[in-house]
């Protein structure tokens, strides 16, 4: 931009430097220039010089009217035409910026990551504004009355060494912007209520050569938390549909998973836990992909008998991506012997 | 209970600079917000300039480029470094606790005079 230009005059705009986004727009430049009694006065928007809208007020200032500006940014700069001059001579020089007021952010959600020594606040900041927007996050303890304040862009990191007085916190958000100022609803927070495990990782798969061949996927995670509930997701490469097993966890071992899957195919398997009762999963695992082995025996694949788990009074559903484009949106399988569980925040679907 | 004292005021040719101080005592000024704010002679409080207990910083558009606000959490202190002064910024400087609003506390101020 045109910040630190020397100006032989001034330039100002009305309403002003940064203004809604359509509003109509006056430019106003004034010469101040030695030894020149300008001919004509012209205005530039980006390097390109401007041709309508433009009224000469008097001899030493001209005006150009822009309706319903609506350019993010836009460098102006003024010239005069000197007598006597070959070139143009510089006026003045302005940035210039358009936007929108923020909206109030919405789905505030924070969430501690086991092991991260952070409380990790995030929200929805609504439409663009087209102009520098800060986030002030308010953090206020419920039980002290003390608030804590932390600048943010997108979304903020606050260390839990400085939530030690308390464990109930009223958290919201604050936008600010040169247009406007809007606070989200305000979220109850018990730290205790928002830890997300340490990640889950499947380790490995194997096949087994039995005469109905079975599956064990083997996965782990470093938590310390005692109660865990999972959800394991899987699915053919090929296929749409995610078949999901729920299950309690407990990691004080390597958990094994064992599955009647269709031979001679390429399935993808995912996992995700949280803690019992509580709100926060932990987004999917990174996909695990496995090759079942061909079948040896002479028994016909009967495709019905899929998914079963070998694990009891646990529940399998499946879940269909309605698009790849559209990796959020799951659309239920109508089959009588599954019950709906949708599979959300589905940051790493595979096709 | 909170107490803020202000410092480093004066009169300043235009284009001059000033250093202001804010000295905070009764919180703790190391988990704290910070802001400054300003009233004109005749005018309303103008919210400046704010900091977060981690140093990150947000400025009114005129003084946006000219102003710098920072902490010392060591000798809990606020700070607003005035450069390229404009007889418009001529008002009575205060410091208040929060990263922003036109509001402060009840402080004394410093008077910052722009003129030539």
């Known amino acids: 931009g045109i910040t630190s230009i020397n100006c032989s005059g001034d330039m100002w705009v009305e309403p002003g430097e940064i203004f809604q986004m359509g509003m109509n727009v006056s430019i106003y430049c004034q010469e101040a220039l030695k030894h020149c009694r300008p001919r004509n006065l012209y205005f530039y928007k980006n390097g390109f010089k401007e041709e309508f809208d433009i009224t000469r007020i008097n001899r030493t200032t001209a005006r150009i009217w822009y309706k319903g500006f609506s350019e993010p940014h836009a460098y102006m700069h003024c010239t005069a035409e000197c007598p006597g001059h070959f070139q143009e001579t510089l006026i003045c020089g302005k940035d210039i910026s358009s936007g929108h007021p923020p909206d109030a952010p919405s789905n505030l959600t924070c969430v501690i990551y086991e092991y991260s020594g952070n409380m990790t606040c995030t929200w929805n900041t609504g439409k663009p504004t087209y102009i520098d927007t800060k986030y002030i996050v308010h953090v206020k303890s419920l039980e002290t009355e003390e608030e804590q304040q932390y600048l943010a862009s997108s979304y903020v990191k606050i260390s839990t060494d400085s939530l030690q007085g308390s464990r109930k916190y009223l958290v919201w958000v604050q936008a600010v912007n040169s247009l406007g100022m809007e606070n989200s609803q305000q979220l109850h927070v018990h730290l205790d209520d928002i830890v997300i495990p340490s990640a889950s990782i499947i380790s490995r798969a194997e096949t087994t050569n039995d005469t109905v061949p079975k599956t064990i996927v083997y996965w782990k995670s470093k938590t310390m938390i005692e109660k865990v509930f999972c959800e394991m997701r899987y699915k053919t490469t090929t296929n749409q549909t995610w078949s999901v097993k729920e299950f309690d966890a407990n990691f004080t071992y390597v958990q094994q998973s064992e599955f009647y899957l269709e031979p001679d195919s390429k399935y993808v398997f995912q996992v995700r836990c949280q803690e019992t009762g509580k709100r926060n999963w932990q987004p999917w695992s990174s996909p695990f992909v496995h090759q079942t082995s061909q079948e040896t025996g002479k028994r016909n694949w009967q495709p019905w008998s899929s998914p079963f788990v070998h694990q009891t009074s646990q529940t399998v559903s499946q879940v269909t991506a309605k698009s790849s484009h559209e990796p959020q949106k799951m659309e239920m399988l109508s089959a009588t012997i599954f019950r709906g569980h949708p599979a959300s925040g589905n940051h790493q679907d595979i096709g | 209970q909170v107490q803020l004292q202000e410092s480093g005021g004066g009169l300043v040719q235009p284009g001059g600079s000033l250093r202001l101080s804010c000295a905070a005592s009764?919180?703790?000024?190391?988990?704290?917000?910070m802001r400054w704010v300003r009233q004109a002679p005749g005018k309303g409080f103008e919210w400046v300039s704010g900091?977060?207990?981690?140093?990150?910083?947000i400025y009114a558009d005129s003084v946006k480029g000219r102003f710098t606000i920072s902490k010392d959490n060591a000798k809990n202190t606020l700070y607003l470094q005035l450069n390229s002064l404009k007889t418009e910024d001529t008002a009575m400087y205060y410091c208040?606790?929060?990263?922003?609003?036109?509001?402060?506390?009840g402080s004394q101020g410093t008077q910052v005079t722009v003129s030539s």
């Open positions: 208040a606790q929060g990263v922003y609003g036109d509001t402060y506390s």
């Open positions: 009764g919180f703790t000024f190391r988990l704290s917000a």
């Open positions: 900091i977060d207990s981690r140093g990150s910083t």
